[in-house]
């Protein structure tokens, strides 16, 4: 007979995992909000910054009451997945400008990387189906300039602080239906 | 040392204007983003605005929005409070407090406050 | 907006006592951004904690902080007389920043 069987692995709360998930989310919307007035005060800019390459918004804060589980860590980890993509861009291609910024975006980049991780175990605790392999993502063009290495991070901080607010919202409104 | 010091307080009737000013030494004011708080009287602690070092971002309190500016002039190493159609509300002692570093919202420092009195 | 209740709202102690003040957040904050301040009878308030359990420059050892999440506590362990005061925690972490209503720690 083999080995007697270990005691069994108890599976943690999900609650317990859902609100650690939280406090990464809500510490990476801090980070973000504080390094995009960091980049306004050096680099002063006007208007909105777009970049077509981003993820749209996932949810209004009006459509929070639909949401369900799977849909929200799929599609969330979808849109962090762009946007880490697209800091690593930023930070290979961004140019001098934006060497101010370090370490600063490095210390970003690696907190997204620690959520993303985060949600793939969520969705594995949670027995969630795993979404199927990201397909290769066509490569991102370099900023056509200094300004435009600027214009794409206030896009891309932008972008993502919006993104993780809507987390933030829907994982706390997902937790009170476990 | 680090010192902040807050003037401009004083009697205002409903409606009126008033223009607080907070004059900074002992560290590099253009480094550190700064805020307003306020403390009505025998109530606790309420955050009023932030600012940014560069002025570039500002948030302001749900209750002060659209009535109050903050704004900075890192030349004269000073923040001010300029605020427009008072209320017997904002009755308070108002106080300058500087940000403990670039990366945490805790505020190290505080001036001793100027009084604001909204009374008709 | 995220709220944060103090609680007892008076702590009646002696000196040479230990002090437990808490402070719950009504949302989940990292432990970062959570501070805490004293705050003496005609005087500014003044930053004992940061980061939840930091000891600022200049406060005395006696004073701690502890906590995670939605719970948070300040402990003193042995009251001395200048500690009586009200004490306030602070979050942050979201605009608009927000204190709690304060706890008066007063001499029993």
């Known amino acids: 007979p083999g080995p007697p069987p270990g005691p069994p692995r108890v599976s943690p709360d999900p609650r317990a995992e859902l609100d650690s998930t939280v406090l990464l989310t809500r510490s990476l919307l801090a980070d973000t909000r504080q390094l995009a007035a960091q980049l306004r005060d050096k680099f002063p800019a006007d208007g909105d910054h777009n970049l077509d390459s981003l993820p749209t918004l996932a949810m209004s804060a009006g459509a929070l009451g639909a949401l369900q589980l799977p849909g929200v860590l799929t599609r969330l980890r979808a849109d962090l997945l762009s946007y880490l993509r697209h800091v690593q861009w930023l930070r290979r291609a961004g140019g001098s400008s934006l060497k101010t910024l370090e370490p600063e975006l490095g210390t970003l980049q690696a907190r997204l990387d620690r959520l993303l991780r985060r949600l793939q175990l969520l969705m594995s605790r949670l027995a969630l189906p795993q979404p199927p392999p990201d397909p290769p993502a066509p490569p991102l063009a370099p900023p056509s300039s200094a300004w435009g290495g600027i214009r794409a991070a206030l896009a891309i901080l932008g972008g993502l602080h919006l993104t993780l607010d809507w987390a933030v919202r829907g994982l706390l409104l997902l937790k009170t239906r476990l | 040392e680090v010192q902040l010091v807050e003037s401009g307080g004083g009697l205002v009737q409903p409606g009126g204007s008033l223009r607080l000013s907070c004059a900074a030494s002992?560290?590099?004011?253009?480094?550190?983003?700064m805020h307003w708080v306020r403390q009505a009287p025998g109530k606790g602690l309420e955050w009023v605005a932030y600012?940014?070092?560069?002025?570039?971002?500002?948030y302001y309190a749900d209750t002060v929005k659209g009535r109050f500016t903050i704004s900075r002039d890192n030349a004269k190493n000073s923040l001010y409070l300029q605020m427009n159609s008072l209320r017997a509300e904002d009755t308070a002692v108002y106080y300058c407090?500087?940000?403990?570093?670039?990366?945490?919202?805790?505020?190290?420092?505080w001036g001793q406050g100027t009084l604001v009195t909204v009374s008709s | 907006e995220i709220v944060l209740t103090q609680s007892p709202a008076t702590l009646s102690l002696s000196p040479g006592e230990r002090a437990t003040l808490s402070c719950s957040v009504s949302?989940?904050?990292?432990?970062?951004?959570l501070h805490w301040y004293q705050q003496k009878p005609g005087q500014a308030p003044r930053l004992l904690i940061y980061?939840?359990?930091n000891l600022a420059s200049g406060i005395p050892a006696r004073f701690s902080g502890s906590g995670s999440g939605t719970d948070f506590t300040l402990t003193i362990s042995s009251l001395e007389p200048e500690d009586f005061a009200v004490y306030y925690c602070?979050?942050?972490?979201?605009?608009?920043?927000?204190f709690g209503q304060g706890t008066k720690l007063e001499i029993k």
């Open positions: 407090a500087r940000e403990y570093s670039s990366y945490d919202e805790g505020f190290a420092y």
């Open positions: 002992g560290f590099t004011f253009s480094s550190f983003g």
């Open positions: 600012i940014t070092p560069g002025s570039n971002t500002i």
């Open positions: 949302d989940l904050i990292p432990s970062q951004y």
């Open positions: 980061g939840a359990s």
């Open positions: 602070q979050q942050g972490v979201d605009v608009p920043f927000t």
